[in-house]
Structures are given as structure tokens and as C-alpha cells.
């Protein structure tokens, strides 16, 4: 099949990085600057992605592959191929419609992105709280109260965990 196809269609011989130029008797012409073709046999080249504004260039566009973008400092990528940039927040915060807000009590976020999540409820696993949680860190669970030697005291357990989600606006 391939042999038949190449005899009938001269464009099938054009490698990646070129296009089959109908204006020049279907010879293979290099993709012009700011365009690319990632597969052979193409009749047009695709326009290169421009990493502008909040996007920055990770890798230039070549004749055979599109440019790769990421986000400028203070932002992070969202979506396939970094289709969007979202503002970073500090640890202990989450991004809301009104900007970065501190995590509510009983929740934490140890990253610059994402939402505040509830502290682990140690008692659900029959354990006690060894280290209290903060806005930036989850609680650390320790042995169950029954495992503690007589006279040993545990840290007061946290308030009941809330469902994950954005803090009230």
C-alpha cells in the first residue's frame, strides 16, 4: 500500500519540517519561520505557538515541533500543554475569585497552587494528634490514646474536618 501511495502521491515523500508545495509542482518546501509540521506528507505547516504575556518560552518552535510554553514566575501552568497560567498563592492560602485567601481553620495547603484541604482526622484511624496542624501543614497523627503509657498526655485533637473546597468568599 505504501509503495502505491508514494507513486500516486508525491506529497507522501515530504518529511516532517516541510510541506507539499502545490505552487511549486508539489515539491517539498521547508516550513517557513514561525511554522512547523510534526509529521510527513503535510500540505500546509501549522503556525507556531507564541509564548507571550504571562507565558514564557520553554522551548522554541522548530520546523518539526511546536513551541513549548510555561508560566512566568508567580504563576503556574494549568491544562494540557500549559494552556493557561494561574496566579500562585503562598503556602497556607488558596486562590479564590477575590484573590489569595488564607486557609480556614482546620484546613491547610502546603503548595503555591490548589485548594485548602482538611486536616487529617486522626481519630478516624484510632490515633491521636501528635503535632497540631497549621494553615501550611497537616496534623501529624501519633499512636492511639490507648497505646500511650500511663500519665502521658496527647495534644488536643483538631476541630472536625470540613469538606474540601474553597473557603468562604
Amino acid at each position: 500500500f505504501e509503495r502505491t501511495r508514494s507513486l500516486q502521491d508525491p506529497c507522501s515523500n515530504c518529511p516532517a519540517g516541510t510541506f507539499c508545495d502545490n505552487n511549486r509542482n508539489q515539491i517539498c518546501s521547508p516550513c517557513p519561520p514561525n511554522s512547523f509540521s510534526s509529521a510527513g506528507g503535510q500540505r500546509t505547516c501549522d503556525i507556531c505557538r507564541q509564548c507571550k504575556g504571562v507565558f514564557r518560552t520553554r522551548k522554541e518552535c522548530s520546523s518539526t515541533s511546536n513551541a513549548e510554553c510555561d508560566c512566568t514566575p508567580g504563576f503556574h501552568c494549568l491544562g494540557a500543554g500549559c494552556s493557561m497560567c494561574e496566579q500562585d498563592c503562598k503556602q497556607g492560602q488558596e486562590l479564590t475569585k477575590k484573590g489569595c485567601k488564607d486557609c480556614c481553620f482546620g484546613t491547610f495547603n502546603d503548595q503555591k497552587r490548589g485548594i485548602c484541604r482538611p486536616w487529617t482526622n486522626c481519630s478516624l484511624d484510632g490515633k491521636s494528634v501528635l503535632v497540631n496542624g497549621t494553615k501550611e501543614r497537616d496534623v501529624v497523627c501519633g499512636p492511639s490514646p490507648a497505646d500511650l503509657s500511663p500519665g502521658a498526655s496527647s495534644v488536643t485533637p483538631p476541630a472536625p474536618a470540613r469538606e474540601p473546597g474553597h473557603s468562604p468568599q
Epitope: 518529511p15 516541510t18 518546501s29 517557513p32 519561520p33 514564557r56 522554541e60 522548530s62
Partner: antibody, heavy 113, light 112 residues
Framework: VEESGGRLVTPGTPLTLTCTVS????????MIWVRQAPGEGLQYIGF?????YTYYTNWAKGRFTISRTSTTVDLKMTSLTAADTATYFC????????????WGPGTLVTVSS | DVVMTQTPASVSEPVRATVTIKCQAS??????LAWYQQKPGQPPKLLIY???TLASGVPSRFSGSGSGTEFTLTISDLECADAATYYC??????????????FGGGTEVVFK
């Protein structure tokens, strides 16, 4: 585009070359370093792109470091040997690429004991 | 690594002749190839990039063609000012942010 910092150094001495530009913004272009040993061909070292990412050829990775400010691009070189004796060129990439388009006159680095 | 093999190493032609220089890549590089001209004591000058795109200010006597692994620089209507060494160079990205932007060995153009 103009390079500076080239001089005679002894083997093992670190050296930093500086590329100073005027008339355009460094942060909008690929800025490239290429070298040429006396009487020899051209060798691509690496570049810093408009996104502040650095890329190096295999032989240069680890021993050469490219960085930039708003008006200069530096090439830091370590563990220099006689084989690093060359004219070092700084160039601006053409059309958003890492093809060297606008070249400086070069600066000579001689490594000898 | 991507090895760029340039031929011939030297070419001698009279004024107004046509010179053809070839560059072969050890693996397919699409159309990611440039040509440079260098005269003694001067930095190289970009002539052509993306295999066939003429750089700004370069006379149309210079032309580039090819794709994949085989590329050609053609200088027509040769002038005295064209006496120089010509280099090809590819753009190729490897893994781990390593690049193989290799230059060919050069072709010296002299006059008969």
C-alpha cells in the same frame, strides 16, 4: 553586541566572559555563545532563551554556565584547559530562534601554563 | 550527537560561476538548518536559516534548499566578495535540555 573578559589564564582557572548589548532587549531574544579555536571551525556552546531557560551542548554541560541581566549575558567557564583556547562569540538569535543572527566581534581566551 | 558533514572542504571557481556546497546530517533535522559566511578575522554572518529563508540584507544570489538529511547552499554569479569559509549548522534538541546545534566542518571558497 560586544564580548569582553577574554585574557590569558592558567589551566584550571575559572573565567567569566560578558556580552554587552545595546539597541535591543536581551530578555526578548535567544542569546547564544559560540567559540572558535585558532584556525578551526565553529563550536556551539549554548544559549539562554527569552523564557530565561538555558540549553547547552553535551560537551559544554556542567563546565559552562550562561546567565543574564537586563543588558548583559555572562558565560562562566570552569576547569579550563588548553583545548578551551578560542575566540568566544556572543550572538543574538534570529526570529525567535537559536540560530545566531547578530554576532559580536569575539573575545580571545588563551589557556596556557 | 548529530554530525554535520560538509562537502567539499574547498572549492575553487572563477568569478560569475555558480558554487554548490552540500551539508549532510547524520539524522533527520527537518528544515532546521542555517548557513553562515565567515571571512578571516571577522565573526560569521548568517546567510540562510530554516533551510531556505534568506537572512535580512543577504543578496538573492545566495539560496538554500533541502530537508531531512540533505541540504544545499548555492551561490550564483560568484563575486570576489564571496571568497570566505561557509558553515552549515543544525538545530536539534535532545533530552534533558541538551542541544545538538552542530556546525559542519566548513567549506572554503577561493577564486581561480
Amino acid at each position: 553586541v560586544e564580548e569582553s573578559g577574554g585574557r590569558l589564564v592558567t589551566p584550571g582557572t575559572p573565567l567569566t566572559l560578558t556580552c554587552t548589548v545595546s539597541g535591543f532587549t536581551i530578555s526578548s531574544h535567544h542569546m547564544i555563545w559560540v567559540r572558535q579555536a585558532p584556525g578551526e571551525g565553529l563550536q556551539y556552546i549554548g544559549f539562554i532563551n527569552d523564557g530565561d531557560y538555558t540549553y547547552y551542548t553535551n560537551w559544554a554541560k556542567g563546565r559552562f554556565t550562561i546567565s543574564r541581566t537586563s543588558t548583559t549575558v555572562d558565560l562562566k567557564m570552569t576547569s579550563l584547559t588548553a583545548a578551551d583556547t578560542a575566540t568566544y562569540f556572543c550572538a543574538r538569535g534570529v526570529d525567535g530562534t537559536s540560530y545566531p543572527g547578530l554576532w559580536g566581534p569575539g573575545t580571545l581566551v588563551t589557556v596556557s601554563s | 550527537d548529530v554530525v554535520m558533514t560538509q562537502t567539499p572542504a574547498s572549492v575553487s571557481e572563477p568569478v560569475r560561476a555558480t558554487v554548490t556546497i552540500k551539508c549532510q546530517a547524520s539524522q533527520s533535522i527537518g528544515a532546521d538548518l542555517a548557513w553562515y559566511q565567515q571571512k578571516p578575522g571577522q565573526p560569521p554572518k548568517l546567510l540562510i536559516y530554516r533551510a531556505s529563508t534568506l537572512a535580512s540584507g543577504v543578496p538573492s544570489r545566495f539560496s538554500g534548499s533541502g530537508s531531512g538529511t540533505e541540504f544545499t547552499l548555492t551561490i550564483s554569479d560568484l563575486e570576489c566578495a564571496d571568497a570566505a569559509t561557509y558553515y552549515c549548522q543544525c538545530i536539534y534538541y535532545g533530552t534533558d535540555d541538551v542541544i545538538y546545534h552542530t556546525f559542519g566542518g566548513g567549506t572554503e571558497v577561493v577564486f581561480k
